[in-house]
């Protein structure tokens, strides 16, 4: 069977352009090293948003310039994406790979539709 990865269907970013969701995977074995990748799918185009490899029980480490942060707890990864704008609305897909020990397993979630609404500019005060 494919490794099952679950994530919420819909999330609304807050007024600061931040969206959070949980990516949960059903691990077939006792993985110690896990790689999580967030992919954005829009109009059949797929781009990588961010990725992190972590050791079970340790924090996720994204690149310094990444728009993602996250924490892990067991087979759950809590992901936060920052700096989103209306044009970033799309399907954000969680891809999980169990890197070590062998055998390798991989699963892909069905995606979280993230809606981003740009805030209205404040009216000028006289």
């Amino acid at each position: 069977k494919a490794m099952h990865v679950a994530q919420p269907a819909v999330v609304l970013a807050n007024s600061r352009g931040t969206a959070s969701f949980v990516c949960e995977y059903a691990s077939p074995g006792k993985a110690t090293e896990v790689r999580v990748t967030v992919l954005r799918q829009a109009d059949s185009q797929v781009t990588e948003v961010c990725a992190a490899t972590y050791m079970m029980g340790n924090e996720l480490t994204f690149l310094d310039d990444s728009i993602c942060t996250g924490t892990s707890s067991g087979n759950q990864v809590n992901l936060t994406i920052q700096g989103l704008r209306a044009m970033d609305t799309g399907l954000y897909i969680c891809k999980v790979e169990l890197m070590y020990p062998p055998p390798y397993y991989m699963g892909i979630g069905n995606g979280t539709q993230i809606y981003v609404i740009d805030p209205e500019p404040c009216p000028d005060s006289d």
């Epitope: 069977k1 490794m3 990748t37 992919l39 891809k95 790979e97 892909i108 069905n110 995606g111």
Partner: nanobody, 126 residues
Framework: QVQLVESGGGLVQPGGSLRLSCAVS????????IGWFRQDPEKEREMVSC????????KYADSVKGRFTISRDNAKNTVYLQMNSLEPEDTAVYYC???????????????????WGQGTRVTVSS
Amino acid sequence: QVQLVESGGGLVQPGGSLRLSCAVSGFSSDYYDIGWFRQDPEKEREMVSCIRSSGGSTKYADSVKGRFTISRDNAKNTVYLQMNSLEPEDTAVYYCGLAPISPVHAVCNQHYFGYWGQGTRVTVSS
């Protein structure tokens, strides 16, 4: 444990034909993409052709359209790549890849592939 085993590579003269096979085991799902990719030492791995298990949607690289044909035999869990009118530029190691997707995922997108075979070498030379 998912395993993909390629066969059928070899040395062929320009204008000749080969048929590659990819046998899949250890994976059971109604939905997946299986693709053929190739790589030579100077280049990144590129998708040559791909087929979706359900519905049979196919995708081809522009460089092989009209020359290569992908097909599948679900009963044998095997995917084939018929390569005709081979050119020296087709020389590479050919890999079979599997993407454990669902209907929401874009057809045959390289980001969704995670399981790979060991590769079979194709050499086109006179």
